[in-house]
């Protein structure tokens, strides 16, 4: 039975040209996290595998940085980065948990960042 829940940074906004941290946290389960996939719509951005380390998709390597923790940092944001992002947690023995974040990249300098948290 899957008892865990994913907490995310929710809906966030950031300025064009800036950077943002995408962060998810799995709680309320003792399941072991074996891998976290980060996807934008159906496009893979990165994988963090417990055994193998990080894999960053080559097409994003110049704008995506691993971390902090299991999170992902997006840099040099453009308006085209606006959209849904998903963190997909593969766990054992529970299975798969998915979290959703909506990022809006704004032209103006008054973008307010959503609340962020750090994984302890």
């Amino acid at each position: 039975m899957m008892t865990g829940t994913i907490e995310t940074t929710g809906n966030i906004s950031a300025e064009k040209g800036g950077s943002i941290i995408l962060q998810c946290h799995l709680s309320s389960t003792t399941a072991q996290v074996t891998q976290v996939n980060w996807e934008q719509q159906d496009q893979l951005l990165a994988i963090c595998n417990a055994d193998l380390g990080w894999h960053i998709s080559p097409s994003f390597k110049d704008r995506v940085a691993p971390g902090p923790g299991l999170g992902l940092t997006l840099q040099s944001l453009t308006v085209n980065d606006t959209g849904e992002y998903f963190c997909i947690y593969h766990t054992y023995p529970d299975g798969t948990y998915t979290g959703r974040i909506f990022l809006e990249v704004l032209e103006s300098s008054v973008a307010e960042h959503g609340a962020r948290f750090q994984i302890p």
Partner: antibody, heavy 119, light 107 residues
């Protein structure tokens, strides 16, 4: 065209070390991790480890952790795999292989380097 | 560590035959499975990744299916150049294990 060209065959004595090179071309070298996989004569494939040409970060198969070192030279787009304390069971063809764009599989392979360990 | 088991270890078939090779994982690996083809004296060649995605330049007669623990590589109509050894690989966990291989021979 992506190409991975490996160094030539080696014959080594037990206890010695061997260093195999793999020169990459046809793509941005620092964008893709490189792996090493070996194949003993008539046997299957065995993963040894991976190295990030961008940062030199590496991950090794526990089986080889104490004996293998993977390095890179970005100026020549070359990765190296050094295996120490060789024994006869290390006789194999050693392949470098580029990590795929969507995960830890291998989309391009070098031609292989035969390492023979014999007294 | 997860173990990958291929079957059969060898098979004989004729040009034009439909060939199916299976790969079983010792536990759930989702869809993180790749298939490779290797000819004698040559390096392996990627055919399929993520269980069903055809690699660039691979003919459409090759297809992959399955998820979880059971996977299949199908060659819809065997061609002379397809006689080779085929390996499956779990591509999301150390030590990135391969199956033992399936040798496809001419009948």
């Amino acid at each position: 065209e992506v190409q991975l060209v490996q160094s030539g065959a080696e014959v080594k004595k037990p206890g010695a070390s061997v260093k195999v090179s793999c020169k990459a071309s046809g793509y941005t070298f620092t964008n893709y991790w490189m792996h090493w996989v070996r194949q003993a004569p008539g046997q299957g494939l065995e993963w040894m480890g991976r190295i990030d040409p961008d940062s030199t970060g590496s991950k090794y198969n526990e089986k080889f952790k104490t004996r293998v070192t993977m390095t890179r030279d970005t100026s020549t787009s070359t990765v190296y795999m050094e295996l120490s304390s060789l024994r006869s069971e290390d006789t194999a063809v050693y392949y470098c292989a580029r990590e795929g764009a969507y995960g830890y599989y291998f989309d391009y392979w070098g031609q292989g380097t035969l390492v023979t360990v014999s007294s | 560590d997860i173990q990958m088991t291929q079957s059969p270890s060898s098979l004989s078939a004729s040009v034009g035959d439909r060939v199916t090779i299976t790969c079983r994982a010792s536990e759930n690996i989702y869809s993180y499975l790749a298939w490779y083809q290797q000819k004698p004296g040559k390096a392996p060649k990627l055919l399929i990744y993520n269980a069903r995605t055809l690699a660039e330049g691979v003919p459409s007669r090759f297809s992959g299916s399955g998820s979880g623990t059971d996977f299949t590589l199908t060659i819809s109509s065997l061609q002379p150049e397809d006689f080779a050894t085929y390996y499956c690989q779990y591509h999301s966990g150390s030590p990135l294990p391969f199956g033992g291989g399936t040798k496809v021979e001419i009948k």
